[in-house]
Interface confidence: medium
């Protein structure tokens, strides 16, 4: 099977409807990183829908990486994770949508967008350019698609999977909440 076929299956397979993820990073592919260490780690496999072992090189990589099987399960599966979820059910927002705006500690002051759980809307804020949290989007549209009710083409995860499909095709995992660029 080609990777494209597998990606296609994630979105359209009628026997396994869209997966209800607790965190969008659980959809990232296992990434061993460029370093050469041999470290046993665990990642959530969206195809098998379970946590699996992989070898991590010791640097970089992505957030879909856990030191223990238990930690992986806690972050990426629910107690009822394997139940069938009808696509007509409203998708839950990722947990990070409920984090407060966090400018971080640096002083770059870049315009970003976050989901304000009080107003239930995406709003602009000034991001310092480092640290902070995942409730941090480069565009208003991106924030709305992922965190607002009824945003985008049917709420949250569809958009994450669509983005993932495109970005995997281009050779890299999605990093919608990591694009903390400085603009000088």
């Amino acid at each position: 099977d080609s990777e494209e076929d597998e990606e296609h299956t994630i979105i359209t397979d009628t026997e396994l409807p869209p997966l209800k993820l607790m965190h969008s990073f659980c959809a990232f592919k296992a990434d061993d990183g460029p370093c050469k260490a041999i470290m046993k780690r665990f990642f959530f496999n969206i195809f098998t829908r379970q946590c699996e072992e992989f070898i991590y090189g010791g640097c970089e990589g992505n957030q879909n990486r856990f030191e223990s099987l238990e930690e992986c399960k806690k972050m990426c599966t629910r107690d009822n994770a394997n139940r069938i979820i009808k696509t007509t059910l409203q998708q839950e927002k990722p947990d990070f949508c409920f984090l407060e705006e966090d400018p971080g500690i640096c002083r770059g002051y870049i315009t970003r967008y976050f989901y304000n759980n009080q107003t239930k809307q995406c709003e602009r804020f000034k991001y310092g350019g480092c640290l902070g949290n995942m409730n941090n989007f480069e565009t208003l549209e991106e924030c709305k698609n992922i965190c607002e009710d009824g945003g985008g083409s049917g709420g949250g995860l569809n958009d994450i999977f669509e983005a993932q499909k495109i970005e995997w095709h281009e050779g890299g995992p999605p990093h919608h909440h990591h694009h903390h660029h400085h603009h000088h």
């Epitope: 957030q63 500690i105 640096c106 002083r107 990591h178 694009h179 660029h181």
Partner: antibody
């Protein structure tokens, strides 16, 4: 004149706890994020933790997450690092530093040595 | 292994120009994050030398200059002096994983006698 003075270091057994303090003077403490950075003997620098000026946001390196807690008391101009479940690899000189321009640490304390050994 | 890579050691004669390199990746320097440089004299705390790629804090001589391009950065020291003998560290932010402030492994600069 900006001054940062660390204290609280010492010898502790593996699994033990220690609380470091950093007394700040010469600048408006509550306006600055603060960090702890450590340096193992003969090794390079490693960022440990940071806290926003208000104390509302905290950040940790993966190597200390769940074991160390950073906090601050702006009324006392003091930064703290509570270190639990200490390991031999936590042995280092611990520096406190204030985050000023860009992502830089403008000023550093003289450091306090933490030795974890049985 | 450090996220940012520096040569472990360099040396130069007094009056010479030396350049210390710092190589990162697409998740730190290549993602347009600023680089800082620190000087650590033997037995002392680090001191900020360059911030925001190429800015000097007041009190730092203009013999020190910094630059960043793509996934690399460099610190240049002209008119090398005996008191420049120290360890030099580059530092930036890395957006991969949970996000972290990262350092190079340090470069020991020796001024030849």
């Amino acid at each position: 004149e900006v001054q940062l003075v660390e204290s609280g270091g010492g010898l502790v057994q593996p699994g033990g706890s220690l609380r470091l303090s950093c007394a700040a003077s010469g600048f408006t403490f509550s306006s600055y994020a603060m960090s702890w950075v450590r340096q193992a003997p003969g090794k390079g620098l490693e960022w440990v933790s940071a806290i926003s000026g208000s104390g509302g946001s905290t950040y940790y390196a993966d190597s200390v997450k769940g074991r160390f807690t950073i906090s601050r008391d702006n009324s006392k101009n003091t930064l703290y690092l509570q270190m639990n479940s200490l390991r031999a690899e936590d042995t280092a000189v611990y520096y406190c530093a204030n985050n000023g321009a860009a992502a830089a640490w403008d000023y550093w304390g003289q450091g306090t040595l933490v030795t974890v050994s049985s | 292994q450090s996220v940012l890579t520096q040569p472990p050691s360099l040396s130069g004669a007094p009056g010479q120009r030396v350049t210390i390199s710092c190589t990162g990746s697409s998740s730190n320097l290549g993602a347009d994050y600023d680089v800082q440089w620190y000087q650590q004299l033997p037995g002392t705390a680090p001191k900020l030398l360059i911030f925001g790629n190429n800015n000097r804090p007041s009190g730092v001589p203009d013999r020190f200059s910094g630059s960043r391009s793509g996934t690399s950065a460099s610190l240049a020291i002209t008119g090398l002096q005996a008191e420049d003998e120290a360890n030099y560290y580059c530092q930036s932010y890395d957006r991969s994983l949970s996000g972290s402030m990262v350092f190079g492994g340090g470069t020991k600069l020796t001024v030849l006698g």
